[in-house]
Interface confidence: low
């Protein structure tokens, strides 16, 4: 999927929303506080400019900017391992003045039987073993400590947890004579949290468990368990929240049914059904109780597990997610798309939009893409004029204000942002589409025609002539 797009940051970014963390006094961490905007609503631009100016003038004082890297720490408890028995671990960049912790779960599909796990080990060993992990990683997107790249949480303690368990972060089985591979995704998260408590997490105010793709699904499967773990360990004051990016999948009917041969072609329900048994997978307790024994696979699907979660979760999902299309056996080759497939793709967007109807905190652009939050240009995409960092900032504010009785959304600060336009790339801020084979940029008109969209059909609801639409899309791509 990577080959189909190019993402570039604009050379410049809109000003970041105001930081909500105070500078630490005399070396000790200070509580972060929300800003009350009511007094400045009349002259917000001027106020924001002042805050930005202040942030920029203070930023050089921070020693953090000297090293952008997150440093690798292999788990001290070496019995919590990757698939091949090597110790799992995490990359950490501390921000001592901050009481926010961001734990990011990496994605990367899964394997669900001996055969496709062997194949994965041959071709993608980094996702099954820690043996060749680099000692440092650069934080990008939401993991960046640069305010320009990460206007949302640039000052947080950043933790990147590499995915090396191939189990959608759900497994709880160790390597043994019987088991060629360990699947310990759920246990890795628990162990990382335990070790981080000794590295400053114990003083956290907010822990945001985030993840992309399989990591996004991992967030849905583990966020409540992390909250429960911290409560049991004596840290009930740490607010645990989730941010699930590109992990909200549908167990819909495949475009073309194929036998469950490999990870990519196997229908998601069947892959997960087999996987849970192979991994000894665990799902959130409240969700598990809603389904019969053997039906736990249901809890891997966002729209089924979400209503059972206690922690607040923000869902980020492209309406036309490439991984979803892949498991649905939709492969956009060089050939123009037939009408049946076009309708299937449009219907997928409609279904996904429907599943997000009751998710108050969500960001779903009508784009064909996959993953966003750790891409450098994650600030570029907007839904109805609001960027993702801005929506997350509004979410933070809404959670802070939620002890007040009002459930109404904050004025001018939306958190439910789901595109309503009906075809892929109808949002002008979508990332550039590239031809899967030639790598050439396709303008939106080319892309839509390639996908078999009849320009008359697309133009009509917009009150346009097809020729006008083509011109507009070619120019606005």
């Amino acid at each position: 999927s990577e080959g189909r797009k190019t993402w570039r940051r604009r050379g410049q970014q809109p000003p970041p929303p105001p930081r909500t963390e105070a500078a630490p006094a005399a070396g000790q961490p200070v509580e972060s506080f929300p800003l009350d905007f009511t007094a400045v609503e009349g002259n917000m631009d001027s106020f924001m400019a002042q805050v930005k100016s202040l942030a920029q003038s203070l930023y050089p004082c921070s020693a953090q900017q000297l090293n952008e890297d997150l440093r690798l720490h292999l788990l001290l408890n070496t019995s919590v391992t990757c698939n091949d028995g090597s110790p799992a671990g995490y990359y950490l960049k501390e921000s001592r003045g901050s009481r926010r912790w961001l734990l990011f779960l990496e994605g990367g599909w899964y394997c669900f039987n001996r055969e496709n796990c062997d194949s994965r080990y041959d071709t993608m060993r980094r996702l099954m073993s820690s043996r060749d992990w680099p000692r440092t990683r650069t934080g990008t997107g939401i993991l960046s400590s640069q305010p320009e790249e990460n206007p949302y949480w640039w000052n947080a303690n950043m933790v990147f947890i590499p995915y090396c368990s191939s189990d959608v972060w759900s497994g709880a089985s160790s390597k043994s004579e019987k088991n060629e591979y360990a699947f310990m995704g759920a246990l890795i998260i628990q162990e990382v949290v335990r070790e981080l408590l000794g590295r400053g997490l114990s003083g956290a105010k907010v822990l945001l468990l985030a993840g992309s793709s399989a990591g996004g699904t991992g967030v849905l499967l583990n966020v409540d368990r992390v909250a429960e773990q911290l409560e049991k360990l004596g840290y009930p004051a740490i607010q645990v929240r989730g941010l699930a990016d590109s992990g909200w999948f549908l167990d819909n009917k495949q475009y073309r049914h194929t036998d469950c041969v490999d990870t990519i072609t196997c229908a998601p329900t069947e892959a997960i059904r087999r996987g849970i048994r192979y991994w000894n997978g665990v799902v959130p307790e409240r969700c598990r109780r809603q389904f019969q024994e053997g039906e736990e696979w249901n809890c891997f699907f966002g729209y089924k597990v979400y209503p059972t979660l206690r922690c607040p979760v923000f869902v980020v999902q492209w309406l036309f997610d490439e991984a979803q299309l892949t498991v649905d056996n939709v492969h956009l080759t060089g050939q123009p798309v037939q009408e049946g497939l076009r309708l299937y793709i449009q219907n997928l967007g409609r279904e996904l939009r429907h599943t997000l109807k009751d998710v108050p905190a969500s960001f779903a652009p009508a784009c064909l893409s996959h993953e966003i939050i750790i891409r450098s240009h994650w600030t570029d995409v907007q839904v109805k004029g609001t960027s993702l960092p801005r929506a997350l900032h509004c979410w933070d504010r809404s959670l802070h204000d939620s002890h007040k009785a009002s459930k109404t959304p904050l004025k001018g600060c939306p958190v439910h942002l789901v595109d309503s336009c009906p075809w892929p790339h109808c949002n002008p801020s979508c990332p550039t589409v590239r031809d899967q084979f030639t790598g050439q940029e396709m303008n939106v008109a080319q892309f839509l025609m390639h996908m078999g969209f009849d320009m008359q059909t697309v133009a009509q609801p917009q009150g346009l002539e097809p020729s006008e639409l083509l011109g507009m899309l070619s120019n606005g791509s």
């Epitope: 050379g11 004029g385 949002n427 639409l469 011109g471 507009m472 791509s477």
Partner: antibody, heavy 119, light 111 residues
Framework: EVQLVESGGGLVKPGGSLKLSCAAS????????MHWFRQAPEKGLEWVAY????????YYADTVKGRFTISRDNAKNTLSLQMTSLRSEDTAMYYC????????????WGTGTTVTVSS | DIVLTQSPASLAVSLGQRATISCRAS??????????MHWYQQKPGQPPKLLIY???NLESGVPARFSGSGSGTDFTLNIHPVEEEDAATYYC?????????FGSGTKLEIK
């Protein structure tokens, strides 16, 4: 630093030809659609031509169609505008500009090169 | 082609006051929640500089005293408080279809 620098302008007789160039630096040129604009003395801005990032798509203003040709060389980070059958009304400052990858706005402009068509 | 009518053609505003420039399109330039209207500033001898994109988004590096609003056919650029350096000609531009056209410009003078 993101930069566009035009060159190739000058004085030319009506019916003559001229080739303008635009050298790009500081960004991945091959990722962006590029445009030419012009501005006659004391007048407003007029769009001239567009070329997509991979040269697949080109568009021209009606006033220049058949006389001007836009092209690009991504290996050399260069945009060109070949102008033939020049007329006095083509006299203007010519700018190249980078189209932001979405939304159809122009976030980087060159400093311009002057074309004067006069006998 | 979509015609953009800018008004006024020129205006003089005192330092610290508000300048308001309007741009009306001959056809709707908004669709699916997005408005394809952008604003530029041009000073003599210089190329245009992007100020506002997609109607209301402030380009990075542009002072927060600039703001854009509007949808459909009617759009506004506001500058408040006006500063000396804001003396320039301002253009609106649409990208709803090809060709992208510009307004005729508004010359802002600081009193």
């Amino acid at each position: 630093e993101v930069q566009l620098v035009e060159s190739g302008g000058g004085l030319v007789k009506p019916g003559g030809s001229l080739k303008l160039s635009c050298a790009a630096s500081g960004f991945t040129f091959s990722d962006y659609g590029m445009h030419w604009f012009r501005q006659a003395p004391e007048k407003g801005l007029e769009w001239v031509a567009y070329i997509s990032s991979g040269s697949r798509t080109v568009y021209y203003a009606d006033t220049v169609k058949g006389r001007f040709t836009i092209s690009r060389d991504n290996a050399k980070n260069t945009l060109s505008l070949q102008m033939t059958s020049l007329r006095s009304e083509d006299t203007a400052m010519y700018y190249c500009a980078r189209k932001h990858y979405n939304g159809g706005y122009f976030d980087v402009w060159g400093t311009g090169t002057t074309v004067t068509v006069s006998s | 082609d979509i015609v953009l009518t800018q008004s006024p053609a020129s205006l003089a505003v005192s330092l610290g006051q508000r300048a308001t420039i309007s741009c009306r399109a001959s056809k709707i330039v908004s669709t699916s929640g997005y408005s394809y209207m952008h604003w530029y500033q041009q000073k003599p001898g210089q190329p245009p500089k992007l100020l506002i994109y997609l109607a209301s988004n402030l380009e990075s590096g542009v002072p927060a005293r600039f703001s854009g609003s509007g949808s459909g056919t009617d759009f506004t650029l506001n500058i408040h408080p006006v500063e000396e350096e804001d003396a320039a000609t301002y253009y609106c531009q649409h990208s709803r279809e090809l060709p992208p056209t510009f307004g005729s410009g508004t010359k802002l003078e600081i009193k």
